[in-house]
């Protein structure tokens, strides 16, 4: 799998999409997980509804939400109020029993807010009371890592 880069602006929302073959993964729940190091496990962040037929319903864990268009074959993850610590490697997964297939490898990059010269008091940080539906979703910039680029830079 190539890694697709999604860039979002700090404080705003980022939408990550993972297309898949809807028939190949028919009946399978999906998940979004965070890769812990190059060889480490992928730690589950959020998964779609326990009942596959209700996968279109948005499920959330903290500031991350997931919804699945099972007919169209697109898994969508929304990271709200993007923060620097959200940057990193993730995977979209298709679940089959205790197995997981990788649908897409994703690198989330968080860009500095161009308005961060303002006072902190002027910054809008979505509160828990505000729903995902109300949150502004920035059209994410995405690209695949170029050949030769290292997805996990070596640690010194």
């Amino acid at each position: 799998h190539n890694t697709t880069v999604f860039q979002g602006v700090e404080g705003q929302s980022l939408q990550v999409s993972c297309p898949y073959d809807s028939m190949k993964h028919w009946g399978r729940r999906k998940a979004w997980c965070r890769q812990l190091g190059e060889k480490g496990p992928c730690q589950r962040v959020v998964s779609t509804h326990n009942l596959w037929l209700l996968s279109f319903l948005r499920r959330r864990n903290g500031s991350t939400a997931i919804t699945d268009d099972t007919l169209g074959g697109t898994l969508t993850i929304t990271l709200r109020n993007l923060q620097p610590h959200d940057a990193g490697f993730y995977q979209c997964q298709s679940l089959h029993g205790s197995e997981a297939d990788t649908l897409r490898k994703v690198l989330v990059e968080v860009l500095a807010d161009p308005l961060d010269h303002r006072d902190a008091g002027d910054l809008w940080v979505p509160g828990e009371s505000e729903s995902f539906e109300d949150a502004h979703v920035e059209h994410s910039i995405s690209r695949s890592l170029l050949e030769g680029e290292i997805p996990f830079p070596p640690t010194s």
Partner: antibody, heavy 122, light 108 residues
Framework: EVQLVQSGAEVKKPGESLKISCKGS????????IGWVRQMPGKGLEWMGI????????RYSPSFQGQVTISADKSISTAYLQWSTLKASDTAIYYC???????????????WGQGTMVTVSS | EFVLTQSPGTLSLSPGERATLSCRAS???????LAWYQQKPGQAPRLLIY???SRATGIPDRFSGSGSGTDFTLTISRLEPEDFAVYYC?????????FGRGTRLDIK
């Protein structure tokens, strides 16, 4: 009618190669996983591996990895199981079967081929 | 890999009697991923039960499946002459997919 029709019985010598087939009809062949199952004489069922004809994604049981090759030609709705070097211990009936796509439980084999008897003897 | 142990190995009963076949897994299986098959001599297996308890299309209601976790049961409420065959359980919760060794149901 939804069915899987397998190629006929084969008699081979050890060391020879073989490719058996499984042709699907009556449904969208590219939309269902196809599995292969071995049944040695008088024994039970052993899962060998599966293939998704839509993109030829293939998974093997560790017991059969490197021993056989599973492939598919979606243009003629046919899956294949092949050996490059047969052994006497490969003598068995080989079944192809379709994975059902029941929501929340995809994976049971709902449609089976009639089986192909492979005899390997010198 | 998941090991499925079926018992008894052979069950001898008469038509009209009730048959209870057991399948025990070495690890917990999600009920959604357990199936039962029937195989008669010279024939391919036939799917009877999926998701541990759901009957496949065209399967008579005398066949029922139950269980969860590691213990699963196939029950044939009233045996008909055509029910005497070999029965296999199968898990597809984890790769590799595995089958039990089978229970042979013989006419007494």
């Amino acid at each position: 009618e939804v069915q899987l029709v397998q190629s006929g019985a084969e008699v081979k010598k050890p060391g020879e190669s073989l490719k058996i087939s499984c042709k699907g009809s009556g449904y969208s062949f590219t939309s269902y996983w196809i599995g292969w199952v071995r049944q040695m004489p008088g024994k039970g069922l052993e899962w060998m591996g599966i293939i998704y004809p839509g993109d030829s994604d293939t998974r093997y049981s560790p017991s059969f990895q490197g021993q056989v090759t599973i492939s598919a030609d979606k243009s003629i709705s046919t899956a294949y199981l092949q050996w490059s070097t047969l052994k006497a211990s490969d003598t068995a009936i080989y079944y192809c079967a379709r994975h059902d796509i029941i929501p929340a439980a995809p994976g049971a084999f709902d449609i089976w081929g009639q089986g192909t008897m492979v005899t390997v003897s010198s | 890999e998941f090991v499925l142990t079926q018992s008894p190995g052979t069950l001898s009963l008469s038509p009209g009697e009730r048959a209870t076949l057991s399948c025990r897994a070495s690890q917990i299986i999600s009920s959604n991923y357990l199936a039962w098959y029937q195989q008669k001599p010279g024939q391919a297996p036939r799917l009877l039960i999926y998701s541990a308890s759901s009957r496949a299309t065209g399967i008579p209601d005398r066949f029922s499946g139950s269980g969860s976790g590691t213990d699963f049961t196939l029950t044939i409420s009233r045996l008909e002459p055509e029910d005497f065959a070999v029965y296999y359980c199968q898990q597809f919760d984890s790769s590799p997919i595995t089958f039990g060794r089978g229970t042979r149901l013989d006419i007494k």
